[in-house]
């Protein structure tokens, strides 16, 4: 009775329970009643990262540097390469084929999570007691002076995008 | 019993292409790939590629990419190869050979074709 | 490409003599294979999978190792053994063979 369905790492063909090739490898010749499956190592530039019966294997994704992309992670014959990209540039989809520039947080907005390779700037607004008057991709909203440590008066409030002015106290004559 | 068995010695003129075969008896030749082994004068062996008989689909050593040309012809159970552009460099014993019925090793060669490049 | 590297490239044993003849691999390999070649003849499969001997080799041949580092061991030299070995890997592609051991008798 020819089998319907196989085992774990194996294939159905002509009747017959196949193994499948290993990961870094791909399928040359099917196995017969007398013979194993054939597989060949994939070449340095491709990869295959299951157990399969695929006759050509996968290219290794390529990181353009022309689209700001550079190497994370070399690939291996089982594993793609992994991209990232270059300093000051993060993915514009969770498949990094390309990068953009970090956003930089506008005054008034202060740097609450700093970009990464694969994130983009997180900007807040700066609440009340913090200011931001440069447009930034890594500031925070930084405190207003305190006036009173300085023995100072606030001679002109603060904002959100400026800092407090301080003067000295009116002195009585 | 398994045989390949290969064309016979070549004598050609650098810049041309030559073309040699590899008949496979003894054994359903669809069920192995053949692969391409040249042994240069220094006697060193070095793979050239693999062609799967039954899918036709070829791998070659990136060496040799440009160089050589698998094909099959399954109604002859004959693999070729082709070598172009030759130059004294391609002088060498070609063989064939294929894996054993079971593991990754080459259990069976060709007897070998002896290409010589000279003007 | 994983490079193999055999040593030494020539020797020469008398008969009764061990010899060993090691193959070491750029990059770890999960067997090693070994073909012996005699003058104006195609390689033989000699050993595989790292210590199998192929059909019809004497028992006198043995092969061990792993990772990168492999070898072929005679544990008493005769005269037919003299040949050149060649250890090849068929983990990575291209598949790579050693540059050969020429055993000679002395």
């Known amino acids: 009775e020819p089998p319907t369905a196989c085992r774990e790492k194996q294939y159905l063909i002509n009747s017959q329970c196949c193994s499948l090739c290993q990961p870094g490898q791909k399928l040359v010749s099917d196995c017969t009643e007398f013979t194993e499956t054939e597989c060949l190592p994939c070449s340095e530039s491709e990869f295959l990262d299951t157990w399969n019966r695929e006759t050509r294997c996968h290219q290794h994704k390529y990181c353009d540097p022309n689209l700001g992309l550079r190497v994370q992670q070399k690939g291996t014959s089982e594993t793609d390469t992994i991209c990232t990209c270059e300093e000051g540039l993060h993915c514009m989809s969770e498949s990094c084929e390309s990068c953009v520039p970090h956003r930089s947080c506008l005054p008034g907005f202060g740097v609450k999570q700093i970009a990464t390779g694969v994130s983009d700037t997180i900007c807040e607004p700066c609440p009340v007691g913090f200011f931001s008057n440069v447009s930034s991709a890594f500031e925070k909203c930084r405190p207003w002076t305190s006036c009173e440590t300085k023995d100072l008066v606030v001679q002109q409030a603060g904002t959100n995008k400026t800092d407090v002015v301080c003067g000295p106290q009116d002195r009585q004559r | 019993q398994v045989q390949l068995q290969q064309s016979g010695a070549e004598l050609v003129r650098p810049g041309v292409s030559v073309k040699i075969s590899c008949k496979g008896s003894g054994y359903t030749f669809t069920d192995h790939a053949i692969h391409w082994v040249k042994q240069s004068h220094a006697r060193r062996l070095e793979w050239i590629g693999a062609?799967?008989?039954?899918?036709?689909?070829?791998t070659y050593n990136q060496k040799f990419k440009g160089k050589a040309t698998m094909t099959v012809d399954k109604s002859s159970s004959t693999a070729y190869m082709e070598l172009a552009r030759l130059t004294s460099e391609d002088s060498a014993i070609y063989y064939c050979?294929?894996?054993?019925?079971?593991?990754?090793?080459?259990?069976?060669w060709g007897q070998g074709t002896l290409v010589t490049v000279s003007a | 490409d994983i490079e193999l590297t055999q040593s030494p490239a020539i020797m020469s044993a008398s008969p009764g003599e061990k010899v060993t003849i090691t193959c070491s691999a750029s990059?770890?390999?999960?067997?090693m294979h070994w073909f012996q070649q005699k003058p104006g003849t195609s390689p033989k499969l000699w050993i595989y999978s790292t210590s199998n001997l192929a059909s019809g080799v004497p028992v006198r041949f043995s092969g061990s190792g792993s990772g990168t580092s492999y070898s072929l061991t005679i544990s008493s030299m005769e005269a037919e053994d003299a040949a050149t070995y060649y250890c090849?890997?068929?983990?990575?592609?291209?598949?790579?063979f050693g540059a050969g051991t020429k055993l000679e008798l002395k």
């Open positions: 062609i799967s008989t039954n899918y036709g689909a070829a």
């Open positions: 050979a294929r894996r054993g019925s079971h593991g990754d090793w080459f259990a069976y």
């Open positions: 990059s770890s390999v999960s067997y």
């Open positions: 090849h890997q068929y983990h990575r592609s291209p598949l790579t």
